[in-house]
């Protein structure tokens, strides 16, 4: 058993049928010595008396808010949560496996640049009685500071019969140098509590591996005289690290017909312009990627050929 | 990534082309190592990230772009003298650079070259003959060093009398390649910045 926060405790249980569970001793936070009784949640049934209460915690029915009283007055509370260990592996019931980029990916994180700011998000089908708390650091043995905000509900989607909820959090490394070569990964730890169930999820990454630039901005077409060709031009996104000559991007320019089956013409360039043939009803899209370290491509920025 | 490669024109900053070749070569070598050594811990998540140049060179600090010198987090151990030698310094354009920058890059390359050659000698003794260093990568390191044209004492190749542990050697190869790829990215950024300055 360990303390998650003041008066909230997590009991770790080896979770299998007929498991013996864990013996837990609760102590009433009071100078009083006698006349103390204990109850669980809203029940008035007295579970025991005395300054300490010993309970055998086996199932969720044994978890909850234990309260010690004296003469009708509440003295203190202890909330017990359960953390299930199933065959040596901590349960992952609360969050959905996003399966990207690999199985057992519960937290996904992205950064728009090398400033040390990043966003993580996760999915759940649970809509109520759910709380998250996020901590982060650079490295784990001698951790350096990363400050995270509060997790917020950022999207709701309908997936078949189920509703899916996306939560996200923004974090910022306290002293980040964009040009630094990372040798210790960022660690992100999310505590999730659903009713009386506690779970924790972690992700470990280098900022360089989660970079995903914003799409190029100011995408424009300039028709070339007496030709079906157009000059496409764009600019680096505002959110990308500067100077751009040091943090350079490379670009992919795509001409896509109206039908998805039509052949796509693609050109790769390090410049911020390209000359392409603009077909009728086609659209031109441009996306960006770090020129020197192949992390994710940005989303496409698009304009119609017409 | 198969991108069209532009051939640098002669007036271009002389080292840019070599640094691009270096990054391509080390990335290819790392990919080959990860495929060949699939049963070894060779991914970024599995290896310890060690920098053999740590406390010996200060490439990131010495080659920091001017715009980032205002960022206190980037100024841990920044030196402040200016570069005056080295053939990559094609013009006064690079006068903003600190004395350490290109010589620091040269020292990095020299250290990695020695490590890779020593490692290759060990790998050639492996009866499994599972993996060797790409000669193209070694050649590209050499070309960039020649283009940098710094005079420095030659570091003798380390020779080891004891029987090599091939498992450990292959893991060390992965660690070296990951670190060298990160340094090659920094070198490419620096060369690109110098070229634009």
């Amino acid at each position: 058993i360990w303390e998650l926060k003041k008066d909230v405790y997590v009991v770790e249980l080896d979770w299998y049928p007929d498991a013996p569970g864990e013996m837990v001793v609760l102590t009433c936070d009071t100078p009083e010595e006698d006349g103390i009784t204990w109850t669980l949640d809203q029940s008035s049934e007295v579970l025991g008396s005395g300054k300490t209460l010993t309970i055998q915690v086996k199932e969720f029915g044994d978890a909850g808010q234990y309260t010690c009283h004296k003469g009708g007055e509440v003295l203190s509370h202890s909330l017990l949560l359960l953390h299930k260990k199933e065959d040596g592996i901590w349960s992952t019931d609360i969050l959905k496996d996003q399966k990207e980029p690999k199985n057992k990916t519960f937290l996904r994180c992205e950064a728009k640049n090398y400033s040390g700011r990043f966003t993580c998000w996760w999915l759940t089908t649970i809509s109520t009685d759910l709380t998250f708390s996020v901590k982060s650091s650079r490295g784990s043995s001698d951790p350096q500071g990363v400050t995270c905000g509060a997790a917020t509900l950022s999207a709701e989607r309908v997936r078949g019969d189920n509703k899916e909820y996306e939560y996200s959090v923004e974090c910022q490394e306290d002293s980040a140098c964009p040009a630094a070569e990372e040798s210790l990964p960022i660690e992100v730890m999310v505590d999730a509590v659903h009713k009386l169930k506690y779970e924790n999820y972690t992700s470990s990454f280098f900022i360089r591996d989660i970079i995903k630039p914003d799409p190029p901005k100011n995408l424009q077409l300039k028709p070339l005289k007496n030709s079906r060709q157009v000059e496409v031009s764009w600019e680096y996104p505002d959110t990308w690290s500067t100077p751009h000559s040091y943090f350079s991007l490379t670009f992919c320019v795509q001409v896509q017909g109206k039908s998805k089956r039509e052949k796509k013409d693609r050109v790769f360039t390090d410049k911020t312009s390209a000359t392409v043939i603009c077909r009728k009803n086609a659209s031109i899209s441009v996306r960006a990627q770090d020129r020197y370290y192949s992390s994710s491509w940005s989303e496409w920025a698009s304009v119609p050929c017409s | 990534r198969n991108l069209p490669v532009a051939t640098p024109d002669p007036g271009m900053f002389p080292c840019l082309h070599h640094s691009q070749n270096l990054l391509r070569a080390v990335s290819n070598m790392l990919q080959k190592a990860r495929q060949t050594l699939e049963f070894y811990p060779c991914t970024s998540e599995e290896i310890d990230h060690e920098d053999i140049t740590k406390d010996k060179t200060s490439t990131v600090e010495a080659c920091l772009p001017l715009e980032l010198t205002k960022n206190e987090s980037c100024l841990n151990s920044r030196e402040t003298s200016f570069i005056t030698n080295g053939s990559c310094l094609a013009s006064r354009k690079t006068s903003f650079m600190m004395a350490l920058c290109l010589s620091s890059i040269y020292e990095d390359l020299k250290m990695y070259q020695v490590e890779f050659k020593t490692m290759n000698a060990k790998l050639l003794m492996d009866p499994k003959r599972q993996i060797f260093l790409d000669q193209n990568m070694l050649a590209v390191i050499d070309e960039l060093m020649q283009a940098l044209n710094f005079n420095s004492e030659t570091v003798p190749q380390k020779s080891s009398l004891e029987e090599p542990d091939f498992y450990k050697t292959k893991i060390k190869l992965c660690i070296l390649l990951h670190a060298f790829r990160i340094r090659a990215v920094t070198i490419d950024r620096v060369m690109s910045y110098l070229n634009a300055s």
């Epitope: 979770w15 299998y16 049928p17 498991a19 199933e86 592996i89 019931d93 690999k102 199985n103 | 811990p41």
Partner: antibody, heavy 115, light 112 residues
Framework: QVQLVQSGGGVVQPGRSLRLSCAAS????????MHWVRQAPGKGLEWVAF????????YYADSVKGRFTISRDNSKNTLYLQMKSLRAEDTAVYYC????????WGQGTMVTVSS | SYVLTQPPSVSGTPGQRVTISCSGG????????VKWYQQLPGTAPKLLIY???QRPSGVPDRFSGSKSGTSASLAITGVQAEDEADYYC????????????FGTGTKVTVLG
Amino acid sequence: QVQLVQSGGGVVQPGRSLRLSCAASGFTFSSYGMHWVRQAPGKGLEWVAFIRYDGSNKYYADSVKGRFTISRDNSKNTLYLQMKSLRAEDTAVYYCKTHGSHDNWGQGTMVTVSS
Amino acid sequence: SYVLTQPPSVSGTPGQRVTISCSGGRSNIGSNNVKWYQQLPGTAPKLLIYGNDQRPSGVPDRFSGSKSGTSASLAITGVQAEDEADYYCQSYDRGTHPALLFGTGTKVTVLG
């Protein structure tokens, strides 16, 4: 004490269907994940499928994906395996089993797929 | 397809020490716990070892398990005639959990 009693096995022709049941008692069935495991005659153990305690997630071996469906009725304390498009290679003893560091197995039920 | 490899058979005379190996990889045994089962003819598997080296109550202490790196082993010290059975190791793969990964199985024969 924990008990898992299986039923539903038998002889079936290729291409036909069969449903296996596993009745649980002696524990809070709705709190635990459950597996199906099979063993072809003279062969080793092969995992078939898993279902979460609340039925929210199901996992299948590639060899049965799209043909077999694992389900549970927590009100009846029963686990099911619906098997469709049966093949000769599905012939095996099928076991249900609890998920956890200490597990409990059903007695097994024989499924024979033969024309 | 079995990812955990066991020897097809091992044998020993009563009182001898018999060991069965179970070889896997970094993503299964290297990252997860190992269990061992004993299966007597015509019966369901019985749990002998869980959590690499833990014995459930009721399992004789002549059975012991261990794990090192990407391999695990089961030892029977002082093998007895009633130990003649098939033995299976089981683990998980970190990418496919909760799918159970079973070993290929080992037939233990007690000679004499």
